[in-house]
């Protein structure tokens, strides 16, 4: 069964800066990745970035830099100030659309006890949906 993992890290140097890493553990071909915050995409979440393997990357503030890390994983750096700034309990979600598996989404946030500079382990997150 395919899985999605989400890792959230707060940068020690900039407390309003987060790095989100997501990956798809499956054999299919990824056609689109959508990163959102505040909940799953389409369920109250706000889209931060859309990564298309062929067409490029579209990102919205406060997303600063989204990138493909491998064929099946991405990273997104967020930085914000004021209303658009993420906070420690913000939930980030990654949705991978792949063929032939369909769409798989997982969400994660900073562990409650994590210090700046530490990150959640890159394990499959508890919220997992298959469309």
């Amino acid at each position: 069964t395919p899985e999605v993992w989400v890792q959230v890290r707060m940068e020690a140097t900039e407390l309003s800066s987060f790095t989100i890493r997501c990956g798809f553990l499956g054999s299919g071909s990824i056609s689109l990745v959508t990163v959102s915050w505040g909940g799953p995409n389409g369920a109250g979440g706000t889209t931060l970035a859309v990564l298309h393997p062929e067409r490029g990357i579209r990102q919205w503030a406060p997303a600063r830099q989204a990138r493909w890390e491998t064929q099946s994983s991405i990273s997104l750096i967020l930085e914000g100030s004021g209303a658009s700034s993420p906070c420690a309990n913000t939930t980030f979600c990654c949705k991978f659309a792949s063929f032939p598996e369909g769409s798989w989404e997982a969400c994660g946030s900073l562990p409650p006890s994590s210090d700046p500079g530490l990150s959640a382990p890159p394990t499959p997150a508890p919220i997992l949906r298959a469309d």
Epitope: I30, L51, H52, P53, E54, R55, G56, I57, R58, Q59, W60, Q65, A66, R67, W68, E69, T70, Q71
Partner: antibody
């Protein structure tokens, strides 16, 4: 054939606003984002932002977030850009450009440009 | 934002000569997903709007003469005109189309001797 027809040149006073238009033809207007660029002599080409004609969602460059407002009228296949609180720094040629078929930001068709001159 | 740097700022060539202009990006435009470089070249003739010549560093747009050749990968790119023609008098801009916001180089002005 794809064509983007922009409105004519504008001469406006400092502090005023201006709204320029870009009428699209030759393709399905709601299938592709519309981008807007500024071209001035000192700074070359700068991306202002983009709008999704399907739902009106916008995405602005941080630099132009307080300067430009992008809208569309789906019934007439027209995109608009309003520029506010104009100063001499806003004097430039402004282009609309269609999102590429193969890539979000390789813009494959451009309007002819609209010259905006800010002068008292 | 990704910074694009072009060189030279201008050059003058005779008809039939080969010309190469350069573009560098402040970070890699190579996608780890598909190994494509998201770099475009535009031609802007005097008084006209920009015209897309090349995307993905080396893919020529339909209708663009084959004397226009895009090359390079990662952070270093070139546009070569194998045999300059009088109608090639124009400004040439590179642009990264990897991610938001798309950013442009300052341009290379090609003059014909």
């Amino acid at each position: 054939e794809v064509h983007l027809q922009q409105s004519g040149p504008e001469l406006v006073k400092p502090g005023a606003s201006v709204k320029i238009s870009c009428k699209a033809s030759g393709y399905t207007f709601t299938d592709y984002y519309m981008n807007w660029m500024k071209q001035s002599h000192g700074k070359g080409l700068e991306w202002i932002g983009e709008i999704n004609p399907k739902n009106g969602d916008t995405n602005y460059s941080q630099k132009f977030r307080d300067k430009a407002t992008l809208t569309v009228d789906k019934s007439s296949n027209t995109a608009f850009m309003k520029l506010r609180s104009l100063t001499s720094e806003d004097s430039a040629v402004y282009f609309c450009a269609k999102e590429g078929v193969g890539s979000y930001y390789a813009m494959d068709y451009w309007g002819q440009g609209t010259s905006v001159t800010v002068s008292s | 934002d990704i910074v694009m740097t072009q060189s030279p700022s201008s050059l003058a060539m005779s008809v039939g000569q080969k010309v190469t202009m350069s573009c560098k990006s402040s970070q890699s435009l190579l996608s780890s997903n598909n190994q494509k470089s998201f770099l475009a070249w535009y031609q802007q003739k005097p008084g006209q709007s920009p015209k897309l010549l090349v995307s993905f560093a080396s893919t020529r747009e339909s209708g663009v003469p084959d004397r226009f050749i895009g090359g390079g990968s990662g952070t270093d790119f070139t546009l070569t005109i194998s045999s300059v023609q009088p109608e090639d008098l124009a400004d040439y801009f590179c642009q990264q189309h990897y991610s938001t916001p798309p950013t442009f180089g300052e341009g290379t002005k090609l003059e014909i001797k």
